[in-house]
């Protein structure tokens, strides 16, 4: 099946991006070529190439190919962003999982199945060997990664740095066990690319063998990236087109997974009375077509046959005999009892009104000129006229005036979270308008995020499940006090300001809260002499979806040794991967006797699209989101850790670059922590800091 | 090894008192809250109340304020739960257990439940 | 208060059967949910904290997912042990609620 044309499919695309090598040791190679196909070949079959092809870049300008050995995963390289620039990078090398024996495997694990350390192929200490990387080329029997050059039973193995022990197999998952979908698996964005019959996946951005319709180009939200596995059409479970000619398409082997809920992301807004959009959230109980007729029960074959069972299209609601749209139709419908009808549309379901029309803003809002005039929590927006100075204090150029017409919601500023406006309450005095981005609008309010542009310090100068106990320079750690007890972590940014998470709130009466600064100890024993107890005066909740809230004290705090504040990132800026930050908190540790003293885990930032693989696909991370893993397996934020700081370090200067949030689970081996991005955010935060009136101290 | 043990069964007049104890052992006991649920016959679980014993501090559900008094001795680490003006909807088998020293915690260690008959 | 509504109230199962739970809770309960097992006579004990966080020595047949309000709790192949009555609970508004309880009966 695998003929020279389709080796591209082995291959991981990523459009307009290139690899910058930042080691001058570092080896490539160039050739003036006209297809990316050509590129695919030469480095599949390492031809006339003084090393192991991993990766190589198309240049679509230049008609030139970069052909490298390494890939975007490899120390010493880079991404960048370059419009001409597509990157493709041998899957074999980037998978952490097998398929069949795993005779391609080309990962990096190097440890048994039983924790022993693999000895490197190089070498015949302690074991005597005769595979030799020249004598296997093309196995890439690199370093003392496990392998499998001869394709035997077990999997990939190794020669063990164990004298006792001769050789052990590796304990690497299959892909068919890794790789798992919720629902009928519409969502699902994997990197399954084999159908259950083991056939390899046509690439979606081809029509070789198999012509069809869903380019990606045409279809931007179906994430048809390189040859995976998708759902694009309402079929019982993910598929793909095949590289054999006689099979155009076939079904893959995907699981559901074990915690089979969907992602807010996934799930069409659920209505009961009328139709949002083509009605796939539709759940409401009209069980009628158009015209009175009443419709069949999903799981009922009589007197239609048909494949749209409860069974086949999990998470549809096919309950009853109710109308829906699980396939993705122009609008709920059903099979009908008529034997002479086979469907029809429930088109007397009532259209929802939706508020404020279809308004919507693109990139940042900039440039909306819609007529909405209320802030998200109900204010009537005040008179852009009448709030100049206060505009002016806050911006450091002249607005367009010519935009700025009576009270609607605007962006003078260029706020990255949308449009905004005065609401002439002096406790609320600006607030965003409920205005969403358009759908399908994915302009970056940051660019570049994931090149280290900026830097994030400003001057050159959780449970914590495993932590360890800290008392250094930890003066702006805040407990946040619900009835008398700990709820959760925040971070004093400001005399007046802790900042911490949407989720720490569950009343919403500010008498029932405290801030306690200075302590060490959860239940503040032992640190009477330094503790400060604050009152709440006001949440300021943080852009839609954002997750985060500025805590307004009802009196500054008072810094001292036990005090202090921390310092808030540059907006927009990128901390490199891999650097060592630290969260903190007073949450669950697991420990059967806790002494209740504030503890601390130590990870460090992965990249958003590792983070993603990690999540073994199941998340992908945004603009907002700042990834980190465990140092130490089996340490990381928990319940009562919530709203608490990641805590960087740059240049001698620490920040708080991500605030803890409920995620998915707690300390789960190898499943990297997100949380909210406070970068994304700083300029939100500053301009809360500016123009919310404090008391004095 | 983390233990909550309870005080034996009561049998009680309608309009009587009642006191129940929680002796624990096996962790510092001023440091977690403590936490007593009830279950009717047949029924199913319903939160009375905690203690912080280190403080003192207590949070009571509405339904309870006036019925449940809830006092912690340090000394000997034990906490205790007393029921006034009982009635006959009082019967139930009353349980302490261990929440966490932060809001929202699960209840990881029970006593084995001390049930209280009310009957003329 | 939040009433949380455990469903099925009953259930007959075999073991090795994979069986879930739900639990819907009348507000937004964030991820403060906890399952509890419970035999007759006995107190209940902790399997799930944190809506998904198996607790320390519970078999991993039991796992938890959900946040908001629903919530969901599967015993992927039943054993005999197993057979008992489930509580859901959430700590996240006073006052602390229960579901009213899943008994998982042998068919």
């Known amino acids: 099946q695998r003929k020279r044309r389709n080796t591209i499919h082995e291959f991981k695309k990523s459009a307009k991006t290139t690899l910058i090598k930042i080691d001058p040791a570092l080896k490539i190679k160039t050739k003036k070529v006209n297809t990316a196909d050509q590129c695919a070949n030469r480095c599949t079959r390492n031809k006339g190439l003084p090393f192991t092809c991993k990766a190589f870049v198309f240049d679509k300008a230049r008609k030139q190919c970069l052909w490298f050995p390494f890939n975007s995963m490899s120390s010493g390289v880079k991404k960048e962003f370059g419009h001409e620039f597509d990157l493709y990078e041998n899957k074999d090398y980037i998978r952490n999982c097998i398929i069949g024996k795993g005779r391609s495997y080309k990962g990096t694990v190097s440890i048994t199945k039983s924790g022993i350390k693999c000895q490197p192929w190089s070498s015949m200490i302690p074991h005597e060997h005769s595979f030799l990387p020249s004598s296997y080329r093309g196995k890439d029997l690199q370093e003392n990664y496990c392998r499998n050059p001869r394709g035997e039973e077990g999997g990939p193995w190794c020669f063990t740095s164990n004298p006792e022990v001769r050789y052990e197999v590796c304990d690497i998952p299959q892909c068919s066990e890794v790789e798992c979908m919720t629902c009928n698996g519409e969502s699902y964005r994997g990197l399954m690319d084999h159908t259950e019959s083991g056939k390899i996946c046509q690439r979606w951005d081809h029509q070789t063998p198999h012509r069809h319709k869903f380019l990606p180009e045409r279809y931007p939200d179906k994430g048809f990236d390189d040859n995976y596995c998708r759902n694009p059409d309402g079929q019982p479970r993910p598929w793909c087109y095949t590289l054999d000619p006689h099979t155009r398409w076939e079904y893959c082997a995907i699981k559901t997974c074990a915690d089979n809920t969907m992602n807010d992301t996934d799930v069409p807004l659920e209505t009961t009375e009328c139709i949002q959009g083509q009605g796939e959230g539709y759940r409401g109980t009209v069980n009628t077509i158009w015209n009175g007729i009443p419709c069949q029960r999903w799981d009922s074959q009589y007197p239609h046959e048909h494949d749209m069972t409860p069974e086949n299209f999990k998470c549809k609601d096919l309950r009853e005999n109710y109308c829906r749209n699980p396939d993705g139709s122009e609008s709920p419908w059903c099979f009908t009892t008529d034997p002479n009808i086979r469907v029809g549309y429930c088109s007397q379901i009532p259209n929802c009104d939706m508020s404020h029309g279809q308004d919507c803003y693109r990139g940042n809002g900039k440039n909306y000129m819609g007529n909405l005039s209320q802030t998200r929590s109900g204010l009537t927006c005040s008179m852009w006229d009448k709030n100049m100075e206060d505009l002016h204090r806050h911006i450091f150029w002249e607005p367009d005036a010519s935009k700025l017409n009576e009270n609607y919601c605007r962006n003078p500023d260029d706020d990255a979270h949308g449009p905004w406006c005065y609401t002439g309450n002096p406790l609320i005095p600006w607030d965003y308008c409920p205005i969403s981005r358009c759908e399908g609008d994915t302009t970056p309010t940051i660019v570049n995020l994931d090149h280290p542009v900026i830097s994030c310090a400003k001057t050159k100068q959780l449970r914590v499940v495993n932590g360890i106990p800290t008392r250094t320079n930890i003066g702006w750690m805040v407990s946040l006090r619900y009835r008398n007890k700990h709820i959760c972590g925040g971070s004093l940014i400001k005399e007046s300001w802790v900042l911490t998470a949407r989720q720490c709130f569950p009343s919403r009466d500010l008498k029932d809260y405290e801030a306690w600064l200075g302590i060490h100890d959860v239940h503040g024993r032992g640190d009477e002499k330094c503790k400060q107890v604050l009152n709440v005066s006001q949440l300021v909740y943080g852009p839609e979806g954002s997750d985060l809230v500025l805590m307004k004290l009802a009196r500054p705090a008072v810094l001292d040794d036990f005090v202090s504040t921390i310092d808030l990132p540059n907006y927009g800026c990128t901390i490199p991967e891999k650097t060592s930050c630290s969260v903190y908190g007073w949450g669950y540790t697991g420990l059967i006797n806790y002494d209740g003293l504030l503890r601390v885990a130590h990870l460090y930032i992965m990249g958003n699209e590792k983070c993603s693989q990690h999540h073994r696909g199941k998340v992908t991370l945004n603009e907002s989101e700042i990834c980190a893993g465990a140092e130490k397996i089996g340490s990381g934020p928990c319940e009562g850790d919530y709203g608490g700081p990641l805590v960087c370090e740059q240049h001698k200067m620490r920040m708080v670059l991500g605030v803890i949030v409920p995620g998915r689970g707690c300390a789960i081996p190898n499943r990297p922590g997100i949380f909210v991005r406070v970068a994304y955010y700083a300029k939100w935060i500053h301009k809360i800091i500016l123009t919310y009136k404090v008391p004095q101290s | 090894e983390v233990q909550l043990v309870q005080s034996g069964a009561e049998v009680k007049k309608p309009g009587a008192s009642v006191k129940v104890s929680c002796k624990v052992s096996?962790?510092?006991?001023?440091?977690?809250?403590i936490e007593w649920v009830r279950q009717a016959p047949g029924k199913g679980l319903e939160w009375i109340g905690e203690?912080?014993?280190?403080?003192?501090?207590?949070n009571y559900n509405e339904k309870f304020k006036g019925k449940a008094t809830m006092t912690a001795d340090t000394s000997t680490d034990t906490a205790y739960m007393e029921l006034s003006s009982l009635r006959s909807e009082d019967t139930a088998v009353y349980y302490c257990?261990?929440?966490?020293?932060?809001?929202?915690?699960?209840?990881?260690?029970w006593g084995q439940g001390t049930l209280v008959t009310v009957s003329s | 208060d939040i009433v949380m509504t455990q469903s099925p109230s009953s259930l007959s199962a075999s073991v090795g059967d994979r069986v879930t739970i739900t639990c819907k809770a009348s507000?937004?309960?964030?991820?403060?949910v906890s399952w509890y097992q419970q035999k007759p006579g006995k107190a209940p004990k902790l399997l799930i904290y944190?809506?998904?966080n198996r607790y320390t020595g519970v078999p991993d047949r039991f796992s938890g997912s959900g946040s908001g309000t629903d919530f969901t709790l599967t015993i992927s192949s039943l054993q005999p042990e197993d057979f008992a009555t489930y509580y859901c609970?959430?700590?996240?508004?006073?006052?602390?609620?229960f579901g009213q309880g899943t008994k998982l009966e042998i068919k």
């Open positions: 096996g962790y510092t006991f001023s440091g977690n809250w």
């Open positions: 944190g809506a998904s």
């Open positions: 507000e937004n309960v964030v991820t403060y």
């Open positions: 203690i912080l014993p280190g403080s003192g501090n207590t």
């Open positions: 609970g959430q700590g996240y508004s006073y006052p602390y609620t």
């Open positions: 257990a261990r929440g966490g020293h932060y809001y929202g915690s699960s209840w990881d260690y």
